[in-house]
Amino acid sequence: MNGRVDYLVTEEEINLTRGPSGLGFNIVGGTDQQYVSNDSGIYVSRIKENGAAALDGRLQEGDKILSVNGQDLKNLLHQDAVDLFRNAGYAVSLRVQHRLQVQNGPIGHRGEGDPSG
């Protein structure tokens, strides 16, 4: 029997300093590239080894980036989001949402909330 998967969602402000090769991560998502069903948000898909994000250690693959330097990432085309990061300057403040799997409980009733919703 499959258990229900529960998630703990937390938000964090991460301040990165752009390194010699940039911020050091990849993103997916946008209104024209939905990565998660019914969610056009921007998600981290890769952390580059030895890049600024990896050296900082807080940003993780799968994190949702809510804003960059206070600018909301809602309803952006994918390339517009990429360009926003590229033009964000030397000191970059990211508001991110971490989603951690915390337990496998007993099987839930059919129709319970989908954690990806």
């Epitope: 911020l23 050091g24 997916v28 590239q33 890769r46 994918h78 390339q79 990061f85």
Partner: nanobody, 125 residues
Framework: EVQLVESGGGLVQAGGSLRLSCTAS????????MAWFRQAPGKEREFVAA??????YYADSVKGRFTISRDNAKNTMYLQMNSLKPEDTAVYIC?????????????????????WGQGTQVTVS
């Protein structure tokens, strides 16, 4: 883990054409940044072409002769190679990474990619 499988290589005469395919696993293929590299015996791996969400990139040596494209419904990327020359002889290798870099993209840098295929041999006589 993304798996990449190339096909379509073979022996062709100079001036001829081939179409290579690279089929990938994964439900989010449309988000992949993908590239073709090639390696001839005794030579360094060389960038050929790349395709991102926003465009395509080519090595000067293949510009105007090769065309990179993708079919997201088939989880497949293609390399149409026309006007082939003997110097195009190599093993052609597909590479991919999930998403778009937020940094300056260097399509020819192998460190941009996380996943690599085994390659398909192209011989131009």
């Amino acid at each position: 883990e993304v798996q990449l499988v190339e096909s379509g290589g073979g022996l062709v005469q100079a001036g001829g054409s081939l179409r290579l395919s690279c089929t990938a696993s994964g439900r989010t293929f449309s988000t992949y940044t993908m590239a073709w590299f090639r390696q001839a015996p005794g030579k360094e791996r060389e960038f050929v072409a790349a395709i991102t969400w926003s465009g395509t990139y080519y090595a000067d040596s293949v510009k105007g002769r090769f065309t990179i494209s993708r079919d997201n419904a088939k989880n497949t990327m293609y390399l149409q190679m026309n006007s082939l020359k003997p110097e195009d002889t190599a093993v052609y290798i597909c590479a991919a990474v999930i998403g778009s870099t937020v940094d300056s993209y260097s399509p020819s840098d192998p460190l941009e990619y996380d996943y690599w295929g085994q390659g398909t041999q192209v011989t131009v006589s």
